[in-house]
Structures are given as structure tokens and as C-alpha cells.
């Protein structure tokens, strides 16, 4: 058995359903996406040995599903997947990778062929711990590269300042596939949000530890860089689920109420 979870049940139905649903979010001139053709292109990877799938195997899939990303709306992330999805709000606020068509259809899904057979493996799929060229990692590598290349304007990045190995994973999709593919001439600046989990450990904040590494890397590449600790709009969203926690006390609101009284 592999280390990862097996192929998601009803993979094809979920994929096609998400694709059809997403088309409504696209501008009229981009709405002519053929979801069946996109599925067939994706399925190429499902016909290969589960440790022999390369990012390039998804080229046709990307070409068929690719669309423009609004300027200033890109939101990259590490170790904050659910928070990013909630905050982006189905493209309303931002458009992270999971909110572009080619990311949406695969978000939180798993897939692979059986090792010595043609059917899908519903028991387990390989992770990077099993083999590098596995279907899921190769997919997200290819998708991440495309997402970076198509991003423009102000680039936003949400990182987790409560992550034990550091807010900026030196070995991660953002470091290895997204930063190198940012198109400098299309980007005005990069804004980082270091979010801390409510009640979680304070591992790093802006200008500390691995964040110094990230800042140096981006500045060396010629990018304008800014960093915000616990970006307030996102912090307010986190506090929805922790309204009584001391970190969520609305000090300014309380002060305003007192003044009124």
C-alpha cells in the first residue's frame, strides 16, 4: 500500500460537476470550456504507472482549462489551505489556485491508477514519500507553474506563522514551483500575510527566521516586498470560530462603544 489516500470516490462525477459549476463564474468570452475534453485530457495521467506521471503529462489539460486571472487577485499560500479557500470566497475576494478552473476541479481530491492494472486504485495512492513522479504531486506542480505565470499586479501570499517548521517552507510548492515562475515584468509588488492560528504557537512573524530567507530571496529577485502580521480581514475570519478567545477581542470596537456610552 502507498502512503497517500486512494482515488476519491466518484472522481469523474465530481470533476465534471465542478467544471460545469465553475464555467458560470467565468466571463462570457471564457465560458466556452469543454468539460468533457478537459476530463479526457486529465485522464491521460490515470492511464500511467502511478510513479511515472510527469508534470508535463498535464500540459493538454492545462491548455484546455486555462483562463486569465484578474490582476491583483492572485493569492498564493502554504499551510493555510482551508483558510485561503474560506477567505477567497469562491473568487469573490481573491482567486487562489483552488479558485481557477484547473485547480478547482482537483482541489482536495486524490487519484491514481493501480500499480499493475488498468483500473483506479481506491485503496491508496503514492505521495512524495513514496515516489516523486506521482499523479497528484505532478498535477499540482504543473498547475502551480501555470498559476504563477498567469499572475499579475499585486501578488498576495498567505503563510502560517504557527507552522512548526517555519512560516516559509524552504521545500514547498511556493518555494520550488511558484516563486521561480513569477513574471517580474507583470508584478508590481508582493504582499505577504503571516497568519497565526488562534490559540496556536507563535513560531514566526514577519522578519523572523524563515521569513528573513523569503524576504531576501524575493528582494534579490528584484521584487518589491511587504509583510503584514495577522492581516486583519483574515484574522476576523479566523475569529468567527473563536469569538471568545482573547486573541479575538475587538479592542477598537469596545473602545468605540465605551466612548459612545
Amino acid at each position: 500500500r502507498w502512503r497517500g489516500e486512494g482515488t476519491s470516490a466518484h472522481l469523474r462525477d465530481i470533476f465534471l460537476g465542478r467544471c460545469a459549476e465553475y464555467r458560470a463564474l467565468l466571463s462570457p468570452e471564457q465560458r466556452n470550456k469543454n468539460c468533457t475534453a478537459i476530463w479526457e485530457a486529465f485522464k491521460v495521467a490515470l492511464d500511467k504507472d502511478p510513479c511515472s506521471v510527469l508534470p508535463s503529462d498535464y500540459d493538454l489539460f492545462i491548455n484546455l482549462s486555462r483562463h486569465s486571472i484578474p490582476r491583483d487577485k492572485s493569492l498564493f499560500w502554504e499551510n493555510s489551505h482551508l483558510l485561503v479557500n474560506s477567505f477567497a470566497d469562491n473568487t469573490r475576494r481573491f482567486m487562489p489556485l483552488s479558485d481557477v478552473l484547473y485547480g478547482r476541479v482537483a482541489d482536495f481530491l486524490s487519484w491514481c491508477r493501480q500499480k499493475n492494472d488498468s483500473g483506479l486504485d481506491y485503496q491508496s495512492c503514492p505521495t512524495s514519500e513514496d515516489c516523486e513522479n506521482n499523479p497528484v504531486d505532478s498535477f499540482w506542480k504543473r498547475a502551480s507553474i501555470q498559476y504563477s505565470k498567469d499572475s499579475s499586479g499585486v501578488i498576495h501570499v498567505m503563510l502560517n506563522g504557527s507552522e512548526p517548521t517555519g512560516a516559509y517552507p524552504i521545500k514547498g510548492f511556493f518555494a520550488d514551483y511558484e516563486i521561480p515562475n513569477l513574471q517580474k515584468e507583470k508584478i508590481t509588488r508582493i504582499e505577504i500575510w503571516v497568519m497565526h492560528e488562534i490559540g496556536g504557537p507563535n513560531v514566526e512573524s514577519c522578519g523572523e527566521g524563515s521569513m528573513k530567507v523569503l524576504e531576501k530571496r524575493l528582494k534579490d529577485m528584484g521584487f518589491q516586498y511587504s509583510c503584514i502580521n495577522d492581516y486583519r480581514p483574515v484574522k476576523l475570519l479566523q475569529c468567527v470560530d473563536h469569538s471568545t478567545h482573547p486573541d479575538c477581542a475587538l479592542k477598537s470596537a469596545a473602545a468605540a462603544t465605551q466612548r459612545k456610552a
Partner: antibody, heavy 117, light 109 residues
Framework: QVQLKESGPGLVQPSQTLSLTCTVS????????VSWVRQPPGKGLEWMGI???????AYNSLLKSRLSISRDTSKSQVFLKMNSLQTEDTATYYC???????????WGQGVMVTVSS | QFVLTQPNSVSTNLGSTVKLSCKRS????????VNWYQQHEGRSPTTMIY?????PDGVPDRFSGSIDRSSNSALLTINNVQTEDEADYFC????????FGGGTKLTVL
């Protein structure tokens, strides 16, 4: 230049508490993480725990119940406290600096601690 | 939590090339970097290689790091071995915490 220096008692009685101090210079404790690592005589290295730049801590699960790491950023000092010492805790204790919490770029000279009655 | 296994001791001739291995017990090094430290007798460790293959300033380019996927091992290669290379070498990686290999004692003949 970057320096870390451990200090503390060379001899501790069994069942007593060990208190060590790591005094750093050339960098800020709010910019770099500091770990404690120990090495019994003639043996390998064992990671004990870390105090992150944000002030939170994490510990080796085998030592967690008797270990505490804290700091005083104004004095550029990191402290280790470990209780219920046994003879197998005899080791050289090092503090080490990290820019990411996953590897060490600078080490202290170490302090040898013997647990014996 | 995985274990990192290193040979206890390795002997090599002056001027030759030696490869020190660090084998991971479960999983591979795909999602975790490996770092290497040198420790001379009675001294504190110093970083020789970090993030698989990067050399800190001041470390001779005779030292290099790599990952051998076929054997699921990290390798520290020392070219043109010198007498001052005689020391203990520790590999290190991480998962939920820092993990060290048991160390290899390198003897230069």
C-alpha cells in the same frame, strides 16, 4: 560575529533539576530560533527542543514531560530547565541557532554536565 | 518518526574520494531536506552541507551533498580527502522534530 555560549553547573545530583543558560551575541532572539541539543560521551547528537522566534516552544517527545525552555530577549539569553535527572542525562549540552527551524547554522561550544552523587 | 542510519565508521586514504551515506528508514527525502555536520574530537559540530547540497561560506568545495533516490539515502562526498577531514559526521533531517543520524567516524589513513 555570531556567538552562542552555554553556562551552568558541571555536576548535578541524581533526581535534581538542571538549569543551563545560553547567552548569544551577534543576532537577535526575535529573528532566529534556538535549539538545545545534547551528546552523551562517545555517542550521537539528540535534539531536545526549540524556542521559536515568536517565543513558543516545542520539545522532543521523549523529554517533553521534564523539559522547559524559555528566554529573556532583553538579555539575549535562552534557558533550559530539566528535572528528575538520571545518570543517563550525563552529556555535553549545546545550544544552536537556526534561521529556519529545520537545521542549525551556528553552535555553542557546549557545556559538559555530569549527573552523579 | 523515521530513523536515519549511518555506518559507524569509514576509513579512507589521504587524497582519495569517500562517500558517507545516511539512509532513511521510511519514506524518502522528497519533502525533507538533509543537513550534514562535522565534529572534530572535543569540539562542537559545524555545518558542512545544508538543504541537501548547499555549502556554507568557508566550507571547502571538496565537500558536496546529494540524494541517491535509488537507495533512499543522502550522501556526503569528500573529494581529495585531507587529514583534517578526520572527524565524526552527522546527517540530520526533520519531521515532527529534528532527527539526527547516529554519526560516522571518518578515519584518514
Amino acid at each position: 560575529q555570531v556567538q552562542l555560549k552555554e553556562s551552568g553547573p558541571g555536576l548535578v545530583q541524581p533526581s535534581q533539576t538542571l538549569s543551563l543558560t545560553c547567552t548569544v551575541s551577534g543576532f537577535s532572539l526575535t529573528s532566529y530560533h534556538v535549539s538545545w541539543v545534547r551528546q552523551p560521551p562517545g555517542k550521537g547528537l539528540e535534539w531536545m527542543g526549540i524556542i521559536w522566534t515568536g517565543g513558543s516552544t516545542a520539545y522532543n517527545s521523549l523529554l517533553k514531560s521534564r523539559l522547559s525552555i524559555s528566554r529573556d530577549t532583553s538579555k539575549s539569553q535562552v534557558f533550559l530547565k530539566m528535572n528528575s535527572l538520571q545518570t543517563e542525562d550525563t552529556a555535553t549540552y549545546y545550544c544552536a541557532r537556526s534561521i529556519t527551524p529545520t537545521f542549525f547554522d551556528y553552535w555553542g561550544q557546549g557545556v559538559m554536565v555530569t549527573v552523579s552523587s | 518518526q523515521f530513523v536515519l542510519t549511518q555506518p559507524n565508521s569509514v576509513s579512507t586514504n589521504l587524497g582519495s574520494t569517500v562517500k558517507l551515506s545516511c539512509k532513511r528508514s521510511t519514506g524518502n527525502f522528497g519533502s525533507n531536506y538533509v543537513n550534514w555536520y562535522q565534529q572534530h574530537e572535543g569540539r562542537s559540530p559545524t555545518t558542512m552541507i545544508y538543504r541537501d547540497d548547499k555549502r556554507p561560506d568557508g566550507v571547502p568545495d571538496r565537500f558536496s551533498g546529494s540524494i541517491d533516490r535509488s537507495s533512499n539515502s543522502a550522501l556526503l562526498t569528500i573529494n581529495n580527502v585531507q587529514t583534517e577531514d578526520e572527524a565524526d559526521y552527522f546527517c540530520q533531517s526533520y519531521s515532527s522534530g529534528i532527527v539526527f543520524g547516529g554519526g560516522t567516524k571518518l578515519t584518514v589513513l
